[in-house]
Structures are given as C-alpha cells and as structure tokens.
Interface confidence: low
C-alpha cells in the first residue's frame, strides 16, 4: 500500500550521511516505471534539503544530523509518477518524528530566587517556587523531566533540614518547626535542578528565604517593679517612665508597646503613654494626688502590642508603688 | 464543611437592643477567632470585633466599644453579638466571620450570610 | 489609626480583559494583606491572603503582590462572575481595616 507509518529520528545521530530511513513503495511499479519525489519544509523548502528521496528505489535519505530542539517534527508529502510524468498516486503524508536525546542542561530562570516565609509556621507551609527550565522532552522520555533537590542550607539552625523542595514542582515547603526570625531571618538555601528525573545533568542556583516577623514575643517589663515620688496635687507629673523589652521587628506594630492601667487607680489619677521611639511607657499624673487623702497608690499595668499575638502569650505586667510627698498647704478657714 | 449561619433578620425600635447569633460547624469552633463586621447599605466593610471562643478573649474596634458586646457559647457552638441603644446608624448587614488561629494570618475565610438589623419606629 | 487607600473606586472592564487593583497603606503592614470579593446581596469572598497566598478554590487567574505600603490584586482574562466589590483588609494590626472597595462593572 502507498502508506508509510511514521518515522522516528533520533537527533544527533551520527550517520553516515545521507542515512536511509525507509522505502517508499508503490504497487504501480509492476505495470510502470516508477518515480519518487518528495516535497515540503526539510524538502524542497526552508529548511532545504535535510532530506531527499532516491527517485527510482523510493529510499527516503536523511542528509544531516537532526535538532529536536529545533523541529521536532517533519510533515512531508511523497510522490510517485510514472515516466511520462503522470501521477499515479495520490500524494502521501510523510511524517517524521524526532527523538529526543539528553543535549541539553536544565536551566534555572534565575541565579538567585528570593521568598519569604512568616517565622513560626507549621510545617507544610510554603515558602516559594523555583523554576528550571530543560529544552529536552519531557513528554515521552525523562530527558527534560528535572528533580529539585536541597544541595545545603546555610546556616544550620536550629538544624540542616528546615525546609524541603518538591522533587517536581520546584516548591519550597517548611518541614520543619522552629522558624525563629529572632534567631535566623534569614536562609540561604543551595538548589540542584537534575534532569533524567534526577539521574542526569546537574545545575545550581540560589534560594534565600527570608523569614518575616509575626508578632510571636510579648513585650516584657523589665523591671517589673517601680517605685516612684510624687508630690501631691502635681497634673501632667512624670511620675515613671517603664521599659519593656520586646523581640520582634523594632518600629513594628508587632514592637510597639500598648500600655493599660489594670487596678489602683479607682479615682482615675494616673495616664500612661507610649514613648514613640524608646516604646517605654510615660506614667504622668491626670489629675492632683492628695497625701492626706491617700499617702501611696500601688498601680498594675499591662503591657500588650499594636498587633495582635500570633498565639495565646502570657502578657507582662509590672507594680507601681507612687509615694505622694506632702506639700505644705496654705490652710483653709 | 466549614459553615457559618446567622440568624434571621431583625426589626428593632430606637433605643432597644438585639443579640444577634452565627452557628458554626465543621471545624474547631473554640480555637477559631469569630470576627464580626457591620456593612451599612451600599458602603464598605467595617470591622467591629473578635472573639475568641476559647477562653472568651475579645478584641473591640474602639469605635464600637459600649455599642457591641461579643460572647459566645462553646457547648453550642454559637457566637452573639449584642448591640445596644440602637439609632438609625445601627441599620446595617452584620456578618460573622471566621479566622484561623494562625495558619490562615488572620484573614476571614469562612463568612456567614449576614444578618440586617434595621431600626425603626 | 492605619489609613487605607483603595483605588480605582470603580472601574469597568469586559470580560476576557485583565485589571489591577491597588491598596496602599500608612505604614508597613509587611504581608498581612487580604483581598475579597462580595457580589450584591452576598456575604465577602477572602480571594488572597499574606498578600500573595491564594484562598482555597480560587481560581489562579487572581493573583496578589506586594508587601509593605503597596499591594496589587491582578485579574486575568476577568470572567462574568468576577464582577462585584473588592476589598482589601489588614490583617496584622488592630483595628483591622479594610479600604473603602473598588466597584468591577461589566463594561
């Protein structure tokens, strides 16, 4: 029959040159002569003459070495006429398939790959994608399928495996709890993109994770305990400046002390203000203290932040004992 | 499947109060946050409050301090929002909405159908 | 108080086109942005989370960006269900906030 199944070529193939792929026949030639021609792109068009026919045998010859990356496929068209130039078959489709070989590396599309992580997230989580691209095919054969592996990880805290990357998606995940952006906000991760499915060609990038701050740390009065003097019937009285400590990102609503006066002050004497930048909290007098009504007040106040904990934490409070001196008052008839 | 429903809606007089509610199920309702968000009629979304059915911890827009009081009831499930004194600028859709604890960094994925409070004479 | 701008406030579109919608902030709220979206008569929809983190069953044609002061909410090849309220919110600090909406009409 005047059919050809399709052809496969290997690329790169080493010849020699010109290489018989296959025969075209027609069963025509038992009562004529019969010529073969063929025609289309890789034919007698761009590219030109990558292959040709033997006329008379209908041997189908390919000239030079072949690209998948290139053209990965050929359409061409066979002829066959007899010797007085007339057709004695229908044009056949002649299609010719190249196959892959493993010639080329994967590539990553970036030497560095930066994402971000929030600290303390639950394993699971993830972090950012790489991507390695491989011109080989991926499709029919493992030469452009790449794996992703996690070559190293600097540094090591709190140990080497903090985060894993799946095999075929490129997907950075957590894997570990203990993300600590207190401790390490950084990551500098050292990726491998293996094609074969990971039994081929190696490349390497770079992956830095930065890791975020959540509001994981309360702040924490440091000291707990004050002790103050005050003298009586002062209004707008800096009575104590409190310090707390607090190890999320500075300048950060997750660092920004909120503080609240949480008993002692039944008469509402006393405010308290956040410093903007050393975050300690102003303890002032709202209205006048009497000593001879009451010669001491001890006030409790709690500490929070502007944004909320990212988990239940235990909140800091810290003890006032204000001393009202006595001012030596003009008497009243 | 994680649901919110709410209760139906409500036709108040000025100056009474209503407690509204918002049923969940299909996850951890006591260690979920329960927001609650006010939408007046053709405006924008305006965040009232949290709860955090738990321990009964609450978080208040100060905006709303004095006007809604959050509380919820573990044993059903349910979260309550009263709204006190009401005027005309109470007449709203309330939504309940759920927020992770963490995992979901305090976004509101899950919302309940909303329930309109109008106030009237 | 944390101020949000929301722009456009409206906008109209045909489907199959991409649009972007921009959130810019007082201060730096880092990633903890979300973006949702209600249609008339219905309850808010979270689309994206942690800026860039998409909700569960959201299509990938949306897709968030940014952190700090500036975020994004982008929309490829807009389909007739896209079209409604967006919103975006801090999630990070009370109280959270969200902007004032950006209407998506069918052009």
């Known amino acids: 029959d005047w059919v050809v199944a399709p052809i496969s070529v290997p690329e790169n193939g080493k010849g020699p040159f010109p290489q018989r792929l296959n025969q075209l026949k027609s069963n025509k030639d038992r009562d004529t002569k019969i010529f073969y021609s063929i025609t289309g792109p890789g034919a007698d068009s761009p590219p030109e003459g990558v292959f040709a026919v033997e006329k008379e045998t209908g041997w189908l010859l390919l000239n030079k070495p072949l690209d998948r990356e290139e053209i990965a496929k050929y359409e061409l068209y066979g002829h066959a006429v007899s010797e007085n130039g007339a057709s004695v078959e229908e044009p056949m489709n002649i299609s010719i398939i190249v196959t892959d070989q493993n010639d080329n590396k994967p590539k990553f599309t970036q030497d560095t790959f930066r994402g971000s992580v929030l600290e303390g997230v639950l394993p699971g989580t993830s972090v950012m994608q790489v991507t390695a691209t491989d011109e080989d095919d991926a499709i029919y054969t493992y030469n452009g399928v790449v794996a992703y592996s996690i070559h190293s990880q600097e540094p090591k805290d709190p140990h080497d495996l903090m985060f894993t990357i799946h095999r075929s998606t490129g997907t950075i995940s957590v894997i570990s709890s203990g993300l600590d952006r207190e401790k390490v906000p950084e990551y500098t991760l050292t990726i491998q993109a293996t094609d074969m499915d990971g039994d081929g060609s190696t490349t390497t990038a770079v992956a830095v994770v930065e890791i975020l701050d959540a509001n994981d740390n309360a702040p924490m009065f440091d000291p707990q305990k004050y002790e103050a003097h005050v003298p009586e019937n002062a209004v707008g009285h800096e009575v104590q400046r409190l310090t707390v400590t607090d190890l999320d990102a500075p300048n950060s609503p997750a660092w920004r002390a909120t503080y609240l006066i949480m008993g002692g002050d039944d008469g509402d004497h006393f405010t308290i203000t956040t410093h903007p930048e050393s975050n300690q909290g102003i303890l002032t007098t709202r209205k006048g203290l009497d000593f001879e009504a009451k010669n001491q007040h001890t006030l409790y106040v709690e500490v929070t932040n502007e944004a909320p904990f990212v988990l239940k934490l235990p909140t800091s409070t810290a003890t006032i004992v204000v001393h009202v001196e006595d001012v030596n008052e003009a008497p009243v008839f | 499947v994680q649901l919110v429903e709410q209760s139906g809606a409500e036709l108040v007089k000025p100056g009474a109060s209503v407690k509204i509610s918002c049923k969940a199920s299909g996850y951890a309702f006591s260690s979920s946050w329960m927001n609650w968000v006010k939408q007046r009629p053709g405006k924008g979304l305006e965040w009232i409050g949290r709860?955090?059915?738990?321990?009964?911890?609450?978080k208040y827009n100060g905006k709303f301090k004095g006007k809604a009081t959050l509380t919820a009831d573990k044993s059903s499930s349910t979260a309550y929002m009263q709204l006190s004194t009401l005027t005309s600028e109470d007449s709203a859709v309330y939504f309940c909405?759920?927020?992770?604890?963490?995992?979901?960094?305090?976004?509101?994925?899950?919302w309940g159908q909303g329930t309109s409070v109008t106030v009237s004479s | 108080e944390l101020q949000m701008t929301q722009s456009p406030a409206s906008l109209s579109a045909s489907v199959g086109e991409t649009v972007t919608i921009t959130c810019r902030l007082s201060e730096n709220i880092y990633s903890y942005l979300a973006w949702y979206r209600q249609k008339e008569g219905e309850s808010p929809q979270l689309l994206v989370y942690n800026s860039k983190t998409l909700a569960e069953g959201v299509p990938s044609r949306f897709s968030g960006s940014g952190s700090g002061t500036q975020f994004s909410l982008k929309i490829n090849s807009l389909q007739p269900e896209d079209f409604g309220n967006y919103y975006c919110?801090?999630?990070?600090?009370?109280?959270?906030?969200f902007g004032a909406g950006t209407k998506l009409e069918i052009k």
């Open positions: 709860i955090y059915p738990g321990d009964g911890e609450t």
């Open positions: 909405a759920r927020q992770r604890d963490y995992g979901a960094l305090y976004a509101m994925d899950y």
């Open positions: 919110q801090n999630h990070y600090g009370f109280p959270f906030t």
